[in-house]
Interface confidence: low
């Protein structure tokens, strides 16, 4: 019959060429000599010569190697005409279908990604996603199938499997416990990604995860002691200021402190602030202090941070002794 | 298919830098491999490194990482090689040389006629 | 990095006979080994690739043969113009590697 079935071609074929693919015939050649050409994309249009056919055997010929990722699928059409020119049978059909060869490797769509996620999270928290891609079919073959890897993690603390990827998203989640911003405030992995479901060409890129901060840390007081003078009767007076370190992240939510007197100022005589630079609190005389009335007061301070703790923390307290010191007041008459 | 490295010989001073190019015709310049070889005098073969223009995708060969920069323009299929801090070691006669995308695993079918570089002062 | 050993380092030989050039390489690079030809003051001409592919245009007098790690260069009815330097080369792994070369002479 006046037929042919879908022809599969392997891409990038070495030859030699022209290599034979199929052979056109009609029945009509028992009557009459049969001159066969095809006419398409591929054969008399762009791209022009990639086949061809032997005018009396019918033999389709292909001229050159193919690419499937230019061209997946070319449709010609075959014809049989007389020695006199006459058409013999209609135009036919003819599916030439480029069958893929793993010959792109797979490429990332960037060099270098960028996430970010919270110290401290639980395993299975994602962080972000890496992709590739790769002009290779991963729908018939796996050739283009890209399966992701994390090849190695810098730096290796605290040990070096903190991140695990999706194998076929690329998304990266957290695999362990342990990220701490203080410690290690950014990671860099090198990803790869691998066509053939892991089993081909492998390309690589870089995936920089930055450790964001939580408040995991608590102010401390540095010192926790202090002793103070204050002349009696001294308004806004500043009787001392008091220093903290806090390991989290400078000038955020989570180390600037807040000051609270726990104790000791029954008579409301203080007031604490912070410092908005220094992070200090300034403790200072709310009213005038009384020599006669009580010559020295014992303080308690606590100190918590902006932001409320992500985990349970102690809270640290300083003591302040003031000494209050004495005035020659005028008599009283 | 055609490489013509465009610049002649070239006479160069130690600690200096020299650029050779090499210009394609008759291919796909993109979708092929370009590769530098140098030959010193009397000597063999080395590979230096190739660049794919498709992407600017390159890959060295450890002795030349930070010797040799590979670029190349799409848009006049030129491919270049800049050579830094040059010494007399780097007196050489230097080939590019297409090689094609078959997953990269193909020998270098077409060179360039190769640009002498002697380096001294 | 891989090692490509060629031999022999020169040859002479007389027009009309045959000679054979071997290299091996350190490693299995299955057949992915490329001949080229050089002569003096020219650029390498590539004959041979995937170690038995002829490149167009070379005369069937060379015959590339092996795979793996050992690999031949064959040239049958040595012509003048067949005098020059050989060099195999390993592409397959990056660094790309050539062999040192054998220089054949004319006797």
């Known amino acids: 019959d006046w037929v042919v079935a879908p022809i599969s071609v392997p891409e990038n074929g070495k030859g030699p060429f022209p290599q034979r693919l199929n052979q056109l015939k009609s029945n009509k050649d028992r009557d009459t000599k049969i001159f066969y050409s095809i006419t398409g994309p591929g054969a008399d249009s762009p791209p022009e010569g990639v086949f061809a056919v032997e005018k009396e055997t019918g033999w389709l010929l292909l001229n050159k190697p193919l690419d499937r990722e230019e061209i997946a699928k070319y449709e010609l059409f075959g014809h049989a005409v007389s020695e006199n020119g006459a058409s013999v049978e209609d135009p036919m059909n003819i599916s030439i279908i480029v069958t893929d060869q793993n010959d792109h490797k797979p490429k990332f769509t960037q060099d270098t990604f960028r996430g970010s996620v919270l110290e401290g999270v639980m395993p299975g928290t994602s962080v972000m996603q890496v992709t590739a891609t790769d002009e290779d079919d991963a729908v018939n073959t796996y050739n283009g199938v890209v399966a992701y890897s994390i090849h190695s993690q810098e730096p290796k603390e605290p040990h070096d499997l903190m991140f695990t990827i999706h194998k076929s998203t690329g998304t990266i989640s957290v695999i362990s416990s342990g990220l701490d911003r203080e410690k290690v405030p950014e990671y860099r992995l090198t990803v790869q990604a691998t066509d053939m479901d892991g089993e081909g060409s492998t390309t690589t890129a870089e995936a920089v995860v930055q450790i964001l901060d939580a408040n995991d840390n608590a102010p401390e007081f540095d010192p926790q002691k202090y002793e103070a003078h204050v002349p009696e009767n001294a308004v806004g007076h500043e009787v001392q200021r008091l220093t903290v370190t806090d390991l989290d992240a400078p000038n955020s939510p989570a180390w600037r402190a807040t000051y609270l007197i726990m104790g000791g100022d029954d008579g409301d005589h203080f007031t604490i602030t912070t410092h908005p630079e220094s992070n200090q609190g300034i403790l200072t005389t709310r009213k005038g202090l009384d020599f006669e009335a009580k010559n020295q007061h014992t303080l308690y301070v606590e100190v918590t941070n902006e932001a409320p703790f992500v985990l349970k923390l102690p809270t640290s307290t300083a003591t302040i002794v003031v000494h209050v010191e004495d005035v020659n007041e005028a008599p009283v008459f | 298919v055609q490489l013509v490295e465009e610049s002649g010989p070239e006479l160069v001073k130690p600690g200096a830098s020299v650029k050779i190019s090499c210009k394609a015709s008759?291919?796909?310049?993109?979708?092929?491999?370009m590769n530098w070889v140098k030959q010193r005098p009397g000597k063999g073969l080395e590979w230096i490194g190739r660049?794919?223009?498709?992407?600017?995708?390159?890959k060295y060969n450890g002795k030349f990482k930070g010797k040799a920069t590979l670029t190349a323009d799409k848009s006049s299929s030129t491919a270049y090689m800049q050579l830094s801090s040059l010494t007399s070691e780097d007196s050489a006669v230097y080939f590019c040389?297409?090689?094609?995308?078959?997953?990269?695993?193909?020998?270098?079918?077409?060179w360039g006629q190769g640009t002498s570089v002697t380096v001294s002062s | 990095e891989l090692v490509m050993t060629q031999s022999p380092a020169s040859l002479s030989a007389s027009v009309g006979e045959t000679v054979t050039i071997t290299c091996r390489a350190s490693?299995?690079?299955?057949?992915?080994l490329a001949w080229y030809q050089q002569k003096q003051g020219k650029s390498p001409q590539l004959l041979v690739y995937?170690?038995?592919t002829l490149a167009e245009g070379v005369p069937s007098r060379f015959s590339g043969s092996g795979s793996g790690t050992q690999f031949s260069l064959k040239i049958n009815s040595l012509q003048p113009e067949d005098f020059g330097t050989y060099y195999c080369?390993?592409?397959?792994?990056?660094?790309?590697?050539f062999g040192a070369g054998t220089k054949l002479e004319i006797k």
């Open positions: 040389a297409r090689q094609r995308d078959y997953g990269a695993l193909y020998a270098m079918d077409y």
């Open positions: 008759g291919y796909a310049f993109s979708s092929s491999w």
């Open positions: 660049i794919y223009p498709g992407d600017g995708e390159t």
């Open positions: 490693d299995d690079i299955y057949s992915y």
């Open positions: 995937n170690a038995k």
């Open positions: 080369q390993n592409h397959y792994v990056t660094p790309f590697t």
